[in-house]
């Protein structure tokens, strides 16, 4: 079997790490390395193009390594910031991987969670239900959710409104 360059499974373009300041940010970097004799496999993170040690933020990186029966290797490095700041949420987080077959990199999509807007829905029986203050955020079409995901969120939102409605009776 021919060895190939490393493959980064995570982060990817389909997952957005949306956090509020004060929350913990956890970003896994999962890389598959096909077996190659004497190859030095490496995985590392850069933050704003720099080594995490050179950035004045409290960041920890934990690594785990697993091997398949064919001696292929999967390395996972989890970058974690215990209490993320709004400044941290604007930084560029890039996972890099290198083997004798080549070097690859992928950026994590990190964003600050926008507080859900408050809005009022006029219910048939005359009560007004206010949503958006709690529960799931209003779906953001930019987050790359597929239509099923959006439907799930809309359904959940409808249930919240429904419960709110009955709560008034």
């Amino acid at each position: 079997k021919n060895a190939v360059p490393p493959v980064i499974h995570s982060p990817n373009d389909h997952v957005v790490y949306e956090k509020e300041p004060g929350e913990e940010l956890l970003i896994p970097c999962t890389v598959y390395f096909s077996f190659l004799m004497d190859s030095r496999n490496e995985v590392w993170w850069t933050i704003d193009g720099k080594k995490p040690d050179d950035i004045t933020i409290d960041v920890t990186i934990n690594e785990s390594i697993s091997h398949s029966r064919t001696e292929d290797e999967t390395r996972t490095q989890i970058l974690s910031i215990k209490k993320v700041t709004s400044e941290d949420l604007k930084r560029s987080y890039v996972c890099h991987a290198r083997s004798a077959k080549g070097e690859v990199a992928k950026a994590a999509k990190v964003k600050q969670k926008v507080p859900a807007p408050r809005y009022t829905v006029e219910l048939a029986c005359g009560f007004g239900a206010t949503g958006g203050g709690s529960g799931k955020p209003i779906p953001n079409p930019l987050l790359g959710l597929d239509s099923t995901g959006l439907n799930d969120i809309f359904e959940a939102q409808k249930i919240e409104w429904h419960e709110h409605h009955h709560h008034h009776h």
């Epitope: 193009g49 930084r91 560029s92 890039v94 994590a108 999509k109 964003k111 930019l142």
Partner: antibody, heavy 121, light 107 residues
């Protein structure tokens, strides 16, 4: 394909203002900080500033704090650079560019073709 | 601001030559250095980032090295399309700063 298309050359009078545009295609502008640099004839590149199109937050090099204003119109995927109180020192080619990776990475991979601004009476 | 000095403003070499372009920072920049190529028509391209990482699509005849304050870009086998001006750029400290450029010409 990532493309940055800048507006055409400008000839402006001293003391006036000018607004340059940079229209992007092939990517979501909200995903990348957008930057501008200045290049005077036979001189190096000088970083002007950048904008986060997601929320409009800007940052400028100290030399351009009172000279440049960067704005964005996400609906048209366009970033603007406004230069005010123009003098002959502002005569230069201005480039917009985008980082290689999502957000604010410092590896400037995609550049516009440049806009020449000439300040002359 | 960190000053980036490219002492050789122009360089003349023959096709096939190995060419080295140097760049010096006014303080240690911890390898946070990129190289750009600007063609005579004004087109700018990223060649190398973080001192030695080749940007995708850049020919392997380009390589970068250095540490501390001294960095270099090497073209191992000069081709006609390499005629351009080369700029170094540091991102160690704000604001990002660029060298004044080294113009490469064919003998």
């Amino acid at each position: 394909e990532v493309q940055l298309q800048q507006s055409g050359a400008e000839l402006v009078k001293p003391g006036a203002s000018v607004r340059l545009s940079c229209t992007s295609s092939g990517f979501n502008i909200k995903d990348y900080f957008m930057h501008w640099v200045k290049q005077r004839t036979e001189q190096g590149l000088e970083w002007v500033g950048r904008i986060d199109p997601e929320d409009g937050e800007t940052q400028y090099a100290p030399n351009f704090q009172d000279k440049a204003t960067i704005t964005v119109d996400t609906s048209s995927n366009t970033v603007y650079l406004q230069l005010s109180s123009l003098t002959s020192e502002d005569t230069a080619v201005y480039y917009c560019f985008r980082p290689l990776y999502y957000g604010n990475s410092p590896w400037f991979a995609y550049w516009g073709q440049g806009t020449l601004v000439t300040v002359s009476p | 601001d960190i000053q980036m000095t490219q002492t050789t403003s122009s360089l003349s070499a023959s096709l096939g030559d190995r060419v080295t372009i140097s760049c010096r920072a006014s303080q240690d920049i911890s390898n946070y250095l990129n190289w750009y190529q600007q063609k005579p028509d004004g087109t700018v391209k990223l060649l190398i980032y973080y001192t030695s990482t080749l940007h995708s699509g850049v020919p392997s005849r380009f390589s970068g090295s250095g540490s501390g304050t001294d960095y270099s870009l090497t073209i191992s086998n000069l081709e006609p399309e390499d005629i351009a001006t080369y700029y170094c750029h540091q991102y160690s400290k704000f604001p990002p700063t660029f060298g004044s450029g080294t113009k490469l010409e064919i003998k």
